[in-house]
């Protein structure tokens, strides 16, 4: 039975040209995290594997940095980065947990972070 929950940074906004940290946290389970995939709308951004470490997709190497922790840092943001991001936690023995973050990249300097929320 899957008892865990994924807490994410929720809906967030950031300025064009700036950086943002995408962060998920798995709680309420003793399952072992074997791998975390970071995806953007059917596109692989990065993978963090417990044994192999980080792999950043070649097309994002210049703008994506691993961490902090199992999170992901997006740099040099453009308006095209606006959209949904997913953290997929592969765990043993529970299976897969998925968290969702919506990022809006703003032209203006009025960029506020949304509240944290939980996905069961």
């Amino acid at each position: 039975m899957m008892t865990g929950t994924i807490e994410t940074t929720g809906n967030i906004s950031a300025e064009k040209g700036g950086s943002i940290i995408l962060q998920c946290h798995l709680s309420s389970t003793t399952a072992q995290v074997t791998q975390v995939n970071w995806e953007q709308q059917d596109q692989l951004l990065a993978i963090c594997n417990a044994d192999l470490g980080w792999h950043i997709s070649p097309s994002f190497k210049d703008r994506v940095a691993p961490g902090p922790g199992l999170g992901l840092t997006l740099q040099s943001l453009t308006v095209n980065d606006t959209g949904e991001y997913f953290c997929i936690y592969h765990t043993y023995p529970d299976g897969t947990y998925t968290g969702r973050i919506f990022l809006e990249v703003l032209e203006s300097s009025v960029a506020e972070h949304g509240a944290r929320f939980q996905i069961p």
């Epitope: 791998q35 059917d42 596109q43 692989l44 993978i47 594997n49 044994d51 192999l52 097309s59």
Partner: antibody, heavy 118, light 107 residues
Framework: EVQLLESGGGLVQPGGSLRLSCAAS????????MHWVRQAPGKGLEWVSA????????YYADSVKGRFTISRDNSKNTLYLQMNSLRAEDTAVYYC???????????WGQGTLVTVSS | DIQMTQSPSSLSASVGDRVTITCRAS??????LNWYQQKPGKAPKLLIY???SLQSGVPSRFSGSGSGTDFTLTISSLQPEDFATYYC?????????FGGGTKVEIK
């Protein structure tokens, strides 16, 4: 340099058994899931089996389930495929393959030919 | 099981041509699609992984695109060493499945 070297192929009669081995070098063997993929003469590629880095999880194609057993000895950096109750349709070149992040096959062995015939 | 359908099964092309091979999955596989090149008597070689990522050491004339169910491998300018058979493969779920292959021959 990553190397995967298969051995153990050969001619066997229907109903017989073979054990294939794949000796790995050049990487941290127990960090990677490993797979077997086969290719019948003149045909396409067919996935056969997979095993996690620790050996704790195994997966099989329906066509070999109950007849083939995948295993690994991480102390020897070696992958195995025990093949029992072999059939003519198991005739193929068998490749062992390394699969990082469970997404793609980045290295293949050179293959070993298994021929099942009377 | 997820079925992978490749087209065409074979094609004839000349050096310098732009070549496009398509692969269709029987259900959505997100980006879990890889492309391999195989030459006679040799093991397959990884070209593109995760739909669009170019494997290290592979020439930039190879590119991949698509997500969900429809994927494309493109060779922008065919070179003599590119005449081979190309396979797509899904890693979304087990059993892993391959397309039937596309043989690229010299016109």
């Amino acid at each position: 340099e990553v190397q995967l070297l298969e051995s153990g192929g050969g001619l066997v009669q229907p109903g017989g058994s073979l054990r294939l081995s794949c000796a790995a070098s050049g990487f941290t063997f127990d960090s990677y899931s490993m797979h077997w993929v086969r290719q019948a003469p003149g045909k396409g590629l067919e996935w056969v089996s997979a095993i996690s880095g620790s050996g704790g999880s195994t997966y099989y194609a329906d066509s070999v389930k109950g007849r083939f057993t995948i295993s690994r000895d991480n102390s020897k950096n070696t992958l195995y495929l025990q093949m029992n109750s072999l059939r003519a349709e198991d005739t193929a070149v068998y490749y062992c393959a390394r699969v990082p992040y469970s997404v793609w096959i980045d290295y293949w062995g050179q293959g070993t030919l298994v021929t099942v015939s009377s | 099981d997820i079925q992978m359908t490749q087209s065409p099964s074979s094609l004839s092309a000349s050096v310098g041509d732009r070549v496009t091979i398509t692969c269709r999955a029987s259900q959505s596989i997100s980006y879990y699609l890889n492309w391999y090149q195989q030459k006679p008597g040799k093991a397959p070689k990884l070209l593109i992984y995760a739909a669009s990522s170019l494997q290290s050491g592979v020439p930039s004339r190879f590119s991949g695109s698509g997500s969900g169910t429809d994927f494309t491998l493109t060779i922008s300018s065919l070179q003599p060493e590119d005449f081979a058979t190309y396979y797509c493969q899904q890693s979304y779920s087990t059993p892993l499945t391959f397309g039937g292959g596309t043989k690229v021959e010299i016109k």
